[in-house]
Interface confidence: low
């Protein structure tokens, strides 16, 4: 691109009188300094539009010469008002002013869009002294312009607490369109309308937008930026992008994929984390979500026993974590388990079914028909019971636990006995005479200790007093007499 300098106002000669505009004179600069200014005043001017016939802020000096003639007003000379150039090109512009020598310590600062330019900018101030006045030229150069260099530049000079401001110099950096908003990837419902937005800026303006779907242009005529494309609906995945055109050329946005939401894939890798007598902890790996977030999952459980009625238990849970504890299961039972998850479109198919088993549990029923009597001749207490119903043991019986508590005149002590699974009777030694013995029995499996039977009490008299009457708990629904040995 060609660097173009365009003047919006006819410039005055750079220097009146002894300072020709070319600077190619015998006056060599007395001093040449890079710009460095310590003060940073607030913005104190309103930029004027190029072409306005004045010379910025003017300071009227109050000092008079020996002949008492007032000094001319101080003002920056007019210079180029508007520079248009392409990105990465170099540019140099300046402002100049003639200052009577009676003024000392004059400094010129550069400002852009109301902010002082400090530090690493290429600003040079040159001083050309003469008998009565010093010509000051402040130059500003940018070696490779960026879009961020766009703006209004002015010079400021401080003299005797007066501030003199130059006319603005407008720098316009032109380049390829620059995207401020690009289309974004979306997941959409099949055959449902959606919008895509594309916005790009110059300069130069205008910027025109073409939409592209799967490498083909969507619109025959370009639309001015910003552009919103309304897609009436898709039945399959598509890739969209937009082209932004201006006088400098074309920029293409990133291509974005528009996915069609679908039901999820079934979960995979359903696995058993832990089993107890009445619960199974499972985990699973979700399948592909169908471009729509998972909401819920359903765990389906059916008894694997061929004789079962085939009914399915369903447990619903949230999608996260991918973990669920299935409860209220029977002990020592086999189950088939499958998992399905849903998104806003619908439910996935069920995962491959896996087989899982619950472990033995503690018995759920106490031994029945507990009978206790005193065998005084051997100073023993005999205990008898009936095995609890096998189906309710929740596992293989490994034995019984007997609790016997002896209470007499403020003394109370509990003893525990273990009995093998084949027994249905036990004999314990009398611990205390003239006392009450309370007996309870519980069945034991590998899964734990079941509930204790209701307590049965028997009084153990002092030596010499005989009572052969047994104490017992009746077996439910069983009126048969209990054999007493």
């Amino acid at each position: 691109a060609i660097t173009e300098a365009r003047e919006e106002a006819k410039p005055y000669p750079l220097f009146p009188g002894p300072f020709p505009g070319s600077l190619q004179t015998d006056h060599t600069p007395l001093l040449s300094l890079p710009h460095a200014s310590g003060y940073q005043p607030a913005l104190m001017f309103s930029p004027t539009q190029p072409g306005r016939p004045h010379t910025g802020n003017v300071a009227i000096p109050q000092v008079t010469s020996v002949e008492s003639k007032p000094l001319p007003p101080l003002a920056f000379k007019h210079t180029v008002g508007h520079i248009i150039l392409s990105e990465h090109k170099g540019v140099k512009f300046n402002c100049s002013i003639s200052v009577p020598n009676i003024y000392q310590d004059t400094t010129i600062s550069w400002w852009k869009d109301g902010k002082e330019l400090l530090g690493a900018h290429h600003a040079i101030t040159q001083f050309y002294p003469d008998d009565e006045v010093t010509a000051i030229i402040a130059s500003f150069s940018i070696t490779s312009v960026q879009r961020s260099d766009n703006g209004s530049y002015i010079c400021k000079m401080k003299i005797n607490n007066e501030e003199i401001v130059s006319d603005p110099i407008y720098i316009e950096v032109q380049g390829l369109p620059h995207f401020t908003k690009q289309p974004e990837s979306m997941n959409v419902t099949r055959n449902t309308a959606f919008n895509l937005t594309c916005q790009a800026v110059g300069p130069p303006e205008p910027v025109n937008i073409f939409w592209v779907q799967n490498s083909s242009r969507v619109n025959e005529q370009p639309e001015k930026s910003p552009s919103v494309l309304t897609v009436p609906g898709l039945t399959e995945m598509a890739v969209f992008s937009c082209e932004a055109h201006n006088d400098k050329g074309l920029t293409v946005s990133k291509g974005v994929q528009i996915n069609i939401k679908a039901i999820p894939s079934p979960p995979t890798e359903v696995s058993i984390r832990n089993s107890t007598a009445h619960s199974i902890l499972i985990s699973w790996v979700p399948g592909f979500d169908g471009y729509s977030p998972f909401r819920n999952c359903s765990i389906q459980v059916k008894e694997a026993d061929p004789l079962s009625n085939g009914s399915v238990m369903i447990f619903n849970t949230s999608a996260l974590p991918h973990l669920y504890q299935i409860k209220q299961l029977q002990a020592l039972a086999n189950y088939s388990i499958g998992v399905s998850c849903m998104n806003e479109i619908g439910w996935s198919a069920v995962s491959p079914w896996i087989l899982a088993s619950t472990t033995e549990g503690a018995p759920s029923v106490a031994p029945l028909n507990v009978t206790v009597f005193l065998n005084e001749s051997s100073d023993n207490v005999d205990i008898r019971w009936m095995k609890p119903p096998t189906k309710q043991q929740d596992g293989e019986l490994v034995g019984y636990r007997i609790s016997h508590v002896w209470q007499s005149a403020g003394i109370s002590k509990e003893l525990l006995e273990e009995v093998g699974q084949n027994g249905s009777r036990a004999r314990i030694s009398v611990q205390v005479h003239n006392a009450t013995c309370t007996v309870r029995i519980a069945a034991v499996t590998r899964g734990g200790v079941g509930p204790f039977s209701d307590p049965v009490k028997i009084f153990i008299p002092a030596h010499g007093w005989v009572d052969y009457a047994p104490s017992s708990t009746p077996a439910p629904g069983n009126a048969d007499p209990v054999l007493i040995i």
Epitope: E184, V285, D289, P293, S318, L320, H322, L323
Partner: antibody, heavy 120, light 108 residues
Framework: QVQLVQSGAEVKKPGASVKVSCKAS????????INWVRQAPGQGLEWMGW????????KYNEKFKGRVTMTTDTSTSTAYMELRSLRSDDTAVYYC?????????????WGQGTTVTVSS | EIVLTQSPDFQSVTPKEKVTITCSAS???????FHWYQQKPDQSPKLLIY???NLASGVPSRFSGSGSGTDYTLTINSLEAEDAATYYC?????????FGQGTKLEIK
Amino acid sequence: QVQLVQSGAEVKKPGASVKVSCKASGYTFTTYDINWVRQAPGQGLEWMGWIYPRDGYTKYNEKFKGRVTMTTDTSTSTAYMELRSLRSDDTAVYYCTRGYYDNLYYFDYWGQGTTVTVSS
Amino acid sequence: EIVLTQSPDFQSVTPKEKVTITCSASSIISSNYFHWYQQKPDQSPKLLIYRTSNLASGVPSRFSGSGSGTDYTLTINSLEAEDAATYYCQQGRSVPLTFGQGTKLEIK
């Protein structure tokens, strides 16, 4: 572009409640969860829970259950988090975040944070 | 609750060095559920790496992630001054979602 803009700082007394807002823009609000994550001064990040704007489905960290309520207003694409019975250890910066599902839950966009100070 | 433990808690490094931050989980996590964040002072956290090794948008290629099972690593090759921040790991495997305690990286 996706943006989450949160309400300003709050100073509350112990026992009071605070309600923080989070306005979403640049994406379809109802498609993603809004999560709330807090960070006590000089501490790490702590997840409080999420809400799915499409149907109001919430999931809370057990630690905050009973004290926190998350809601949304889909007409304004705004999420709210209310924390009740405030204690001094609730002093923190509260962030709203967009939860990216992909079944793998991470937070791809964050709000600028709202400082809540609980002091008597 | 899955507990994530980062190591070290603090590290002071010179520019151009290679930095490794590790994160150990209390139970096995699929690599798909493991993510890293960067938080610079007085800023919100920013997604850095998702699914163990995928760089989030705009993240420089000097960052990388790896790991499986219970042990995950964030690596910064040729550290730059702008990398001074606190780094957090996060798991998306189970609720409650949890973060590591953070690793503060200081540039010497």
